[in-house]
């Protein structure tokens, strides 16, 4: 019989229900914005905005200072007071829409939904390792702001993204705001603008450059700005917006907008459609060619990538890549595939595609009918003409006007659909050693830290744990402070180590020591932990073998048993070859001689499952007693594997030595032609791994084996005669003298 060890699912080596408690801060209201500051002198801060309040936290998430930012018109509003005596507009709550650092001196800038979306500048003062905010400056000059032209009206109540760029010594605010007709009329913010902060912090310089959704499209064409960032020579905005100005406004797609970070102008404003798809390895019937589209960006982050992912993306290590989590629609509801997919867009490739798009529009020969696009911002035109013009005039350049690149950038889900039902709501990507890790927050308040790698059919988890008991969605914006990431969920801010919250979710020594080096996991006798958790017994260099099962569970006291051991950390080498003298198995007092691995039986084990098998021949010693005993596997002097060496002993109860007894055989005669069905009755007849009924030395073919009975068909006899009949278990004869009589047919 060929018994095989049962597979252990890979998931059994970890437990994602393990509770981790990470430092947190209760903000007293839904967290609306969060930003971190790290100074040159080891001082740092976390700024957390909720409705009508701005909290300053130390690096330990303890409150250092709190500032009232609203309601506007309330005498207790500390920021409002910086604008001098009012009234400054209708009273109302202040929802923070923008919270950014101006690196120049440095200072924190906050902009809210009240007071026409104006901003406040707070100088930072280090106090030890904490930071305080100076009295706010009101970035608003009454004399140059009008309802129709307001350089100091920055934030839209519908949402605003800001990236601050230093050019020379000036701070330029790259601002992108969602608009509708009502907001555009009352606030006069712009969709996209570049505003220079005046040196005296009296507001933003008038005459700034801007693009805005044209009034006729404001009702139907809404742009959501999901993310903004600055890398290299450009600032990028990521948007979700209707795919067409004229078609169904609910048919959305994702775009990347690129602006120059070196020149505060919008002539080289470019947009590119980002296309993210789920393309399963085996396409279902009826599934779309090229994969299922996931057109709506939910969250994004750009980061330099580690060596392994860089190789898979065919780019150099350390190059910047934009990662986006995409869903099928605004509600992110389930489709055929996973709820969320993650696509990677290398920035250099994005830039190349944009530049090629400009060439197609502006270099002869231009393909007839190629549109400049962005008809929601500017008058329609065909390339190479400027917006609204029939032809280029000699003193204008095709390149100096905004353009939608005619081709999209298409990528497929890095995770091959493995996120399944998970709805990702937050994303931050880091490079740790040569590994690229996606730190993701979810709709149900969990954090997933997963290696970004393309080629696998399972997820490589650093961790997967619940932030708290509320189960509230993790919010979009994530900040980094030193070796920690700050996630917000509901009214809480949580501080999660980039290396993961701990190691206790790894249940086996092997899984523990195979964890990434940066996690600092070690084995503590019977659990996986970090050194601080168990300083006495913590080690990272070896694992004992682990027996989980064996077969058979009993064997004869006389004769041999081929014992198959199941478990992990037997070999560390896929071949399962064992150097001489490294593995010692004893059953009770008896040794079990290791058997060479039968190479014909070697079969690939997918990483999703794991099991190791070890076979040995058990020959009980003469002193061995009948009854239950332990199986013990000791491994010593094994050469080290990639992650650790195997060393130690594993003991498992449940093996019994038994003495088979043959009590009766019937019938005791049969035809010489053979085929008589013999029934052998007794006790412990099924022990061990081999048994044979011999009729005159020839094997009687076993038809059924049970503890108390054997059935076999007699072989043909040479002559009519009485012949010896014996039972061997494990190659040893069971006591008793029996004969079988062959008769004429």
């Amino acid at each position: 019989e060929d018994w095989q060890c049962p597979r252990t699912p890979y998931a059994a080596s970890r437990d994602f229900d393990v509770k981790y408690v990470v430092p947190s801060f209760s903000a007293g209201g839904l967290v609306q914005a969060m930003v971190t500051y790290e100074g040159d002198r080891n001082e740092s801060a976390v700024f957390v905005a909720i409705r009508n309040r701005l909290h300053v936290l130390g690096p330990d998430l303890k409150s250092v200072q709190s500032l009232a930012t609203g309601p506007a018109g309330d005498p207790g509003c500390q920021t409002c007071a910086a604008c001098g005596p009012g009234p400054h507009g209708p009273p109302g709550d202040t929802d923070t829409k923008v919270l950014v650092l101006d690196p120049a001196l440095p200072a924190l800038v906050s902009c809210g939904s009240s007071l026409q979306g104006r901003c406040f500048l707070h100088d930072l003062e280090p106090q030890g390792t904490a930071v305080h905010l100076a009295a706010p400056a009101c970035l608003f000059s009454a004399h140059h702001n009008r309802p129709d032209d307001c350089p100091d009206c920055v934030a839209s109540p519908l949402g605003t993204r800001v990236t601050v760029v230093e050019q020379g010594q000036a701070s330029y605010f790259y601002v992108a705001s969602s608009l509708d007709a009502a907001v555009a009329a009352s606030f006069s913010p712009r969709s996209v603008s570049i505003r220079r902060l005046k040196a005296d912090a009296s507001g933003f310089a008038p005459g700034f450059v801007a693009l805005s959704v044209l009034p006729k499209h404001l009702v139907s064409y809404s742009i959501e700005y999901v993310h903004s960032f600055h890398t290299g020579a450009f600032v990028y905005f990521l948007t979700v917006q209707p795919a067409s100005v004229t078609d169904d406004p609910s048919a959305l797609h994702t775009r990347l907008a690129r602006l120059s970070a070196t020149e505060p102008e919008l002539g080289d404003y470019r947009e590119l459609v980002l296309d993210c798809r789920f393309a399963p390895k085996r396409r279902r019937r009826g599934a779309p060619e090229g994969g299922q589209p996931y057109p709506v960006l939910r969250v994004a982050h750009s980061a330099p990538v580690g060596a392994q992912l860089a190789t898979e993306l065919s780019i150099a290590e350390g190059q910047e890549v934009l990662f986006g989590v995409f869903v099928t629609g605004k509600d992110g509801g389930p489709g055929v595939g996973p709820n969320s997919v993650v696509c990677a867009f290398p920035i250099d490739l994005l830039d190349t595609l944009i530049d090629e798009g400009v060439e197609r529009c502006c270099e002869s020969p231009v393909h007839p009918g190629l549109r400049r696009g962005l008809d929601f911002f500017q008058s329609p035109s065909f390339c190479p003409n400027p917006p609204g013009l029939e032809a280029l005039s000699p003193n204008t350049s095709c390149r100096h006007f905004p353009l939608l690149v005619s081709s999209s950038f298409s990528r497929v889900d890095l995770f091959n659909g493995l996120l399944g039902p998970v709805q990702v709501t937050a994303l931050y990507v880091t490079r740790l050693d040569n590994v690229t890790v996606a730190h993701m927050g979810t709709m149900d308040g969990r954090i997933l830290q997963v290696e970004l790698v393309r080629s696998l059919n399972y997820l490589l988890y650093v961790s997967n744990f619940s932030l708290g008991d509320s189960g509230q969605p993790v919010q979009r914006d994530v900040s980094r402070l030193g070796d920690h990431l700050l996630f917000a969920s509901g009214d809480q801010v949580f501080q999660v180590p980039i290396q993961g919250p701990g190691c206790r979710h790894f249940l086996t020594c092997g899984r523990c020591l195979r964890a990434w080096h940066f996690m600092g996991c070690g084995w503590c006798g019977n659990m996986c932990g970090q050194q601080k958790e168990c300083p006495g017994s913590w080690q990272q260099d070896h694992c004992p073998p682990k027996l989980t099962e064996f077969h058979p569970h009993s064997g004869p006291l006389r004769g041999s048993t081929r014992l198959t051991l199941c478990g992990s950390n037997f070999y560390l080498h896929p071949s399962g070859l064992v150097p001489e003298g490294t593995h010692q198995v004893t059953v009770g007092q008896s040794p079990c001689r290791p058997l060479p691995k039968d190479s014909s039986k070697l079969r690939p084990v997918p990483r999703k499952d794991f099991v190791e098998e070890f076979e040995c021949e058990l020959e009980p010693l003469g002193t061995q007693a009948v009854g239950p005993t332990n199986v013990s596997l000791t491994v010593t002097n094994m050469p080290p594997g990639k992650h650790f060496r195997v060393d130690g002993t594993s003991v498992l109860r449940g093996f019994s030595f038994m003495e088979p007894v043959l009590i009766a055989v019937q019938p005791l005669f049969g035809p010489r032609a053979g085929g008589t069905c013999l029934t052998l009755e007794g006790q412990s007849l099924s022990v061990g791994t081999s048994r044979a009924v011999l009729v005159n030395g020839t094997e009687c073919l076993l038809a059924r084996v049970s503890e108390g009975q054997l059935l076999c068909a007699t072989p043909p006899g040479a002559t009519v005669a009485s012949v010896p009949l014996s039972l061997q278990v494990g190659g040893a004869q069971v006591p008793g003298s029996w004969t079988f009589q062959y008769r004429e047919d």
Epitope: P126, A170, G203
Partner: antibody
Framework: EVQLQQSGPELVKPGASMKISCKAS????????MNWVKQSHGKKLEWIGL????????IYNQKFKGKATLTVDKSSSTAYMELLSLTSEDSAVYYC?????????????WGQGASVTVSS | DILLTQSPAILSVSPGERVSFSCRAS??????IHWYQQRTNGSPRLLIK???ESISGIPSRFSGSGSGTDFTLSINSVESEDIADYYC?????????FGAGTKLEVK
């Protein structure tokens, strides 16, 4: 009463470096940025840069980067400007002036000036 | 850098007369202009901030106006103690810059 007391006149050799001090009193030193202004003999005023005593943040006029280094000592409410590799072009009166970098404020108090003569 | 051009270089007036100093910016700076007076061997003294805002302790005969690129400092009745150099300074953009100054002489 707000006062900015600067160190006395200096005669220094070409190639040398020197440090001018500006001791503030009568107000919260960390509450205002400290600006430094050069007035050469042609009466021209040139802004050198500022330092925020609050956090040590500095902004320099590109023209003076590498020539002037601004520092503060919060414990003594004193701002310093070090002038490096002096030449005859650096002979001038140097002023410190406080400025609240906020809408609505200008350089409202100035030191008495520190005269620097660079000569061999 | 923003260039501030002051004119004239020298103004000569009689006591009691009204006098105006001009400062023109090379680009629009809103009202981020400030005026200083510097008497002989003295330090600059702030007279007017943000183009037209008065400073406590400064006589009311000093006033300012303008926005964008053109700014004016006025003394509505000159006194002998007003003999000094007058400088404009912009705080709109880095680096902060000063005008070359106008010298006021009293006949």
């Amino acid at each position: 009463e707000v006062q900015l007391q600067q160190s006395g006149p200096e005669l220094v050799k070409p190639g040398a470096s020197m440090k001018i001090s500006c001791k503030a009193s009568g107000y919260s030193f960390t509450g205002y940025t400290m600006n430094w202004v050069k007035q050469s003999h042609g009466k021209k005023l040139e802004w050198i840069g500022l330092i925020n005593p609050y956090n040590g943040g500095t902004i320099y006029n590109q023209k003076f980067k590498g020539k002037a280094t601004l520092t503060v000592d919060k414990s003594s409410s004193t701002a310093y400007m070090e002038l490096l590799s002096l030449t005859s072009e650096d002979s001038a009166v140097y002023y410190c002036a406080r400025w609240l970098r906020r809408g609505g404020y200008a350089m409202d108090y100035w030191g008495q000036g520190a005269s620097v003569t660079v000569s061999s | 850098d923003i260039l501030l051009t002051q004119s004239p270089a020298i103004l000569s007036v009689s006591p009691g007369e009204r006098v105006s100093f001009s400062c023109r910016a090379s680009q629009s700076i809103g009202t981020s202009i400030h005026w200083y007076q510097q008497r002989t061997n003295g330090s600059p003294r702030l007279l007017i901030k943000f183009a037209s805002e008065s400073i406590s302790g400064i006589p009311s005969r000093f006033s300012g106006s303008g926005s964008g690129t053109d700014f004016t400092l006025s003394i509505n009745s000159v006194e002998s103690e007003d003999i000094a150099d007058y400088y404009c300074q912009q705080s709109d953009s880095w680096p902060l810059t000063f005008g070359a100054g106008t010298k006021l002489e009293v006949k």
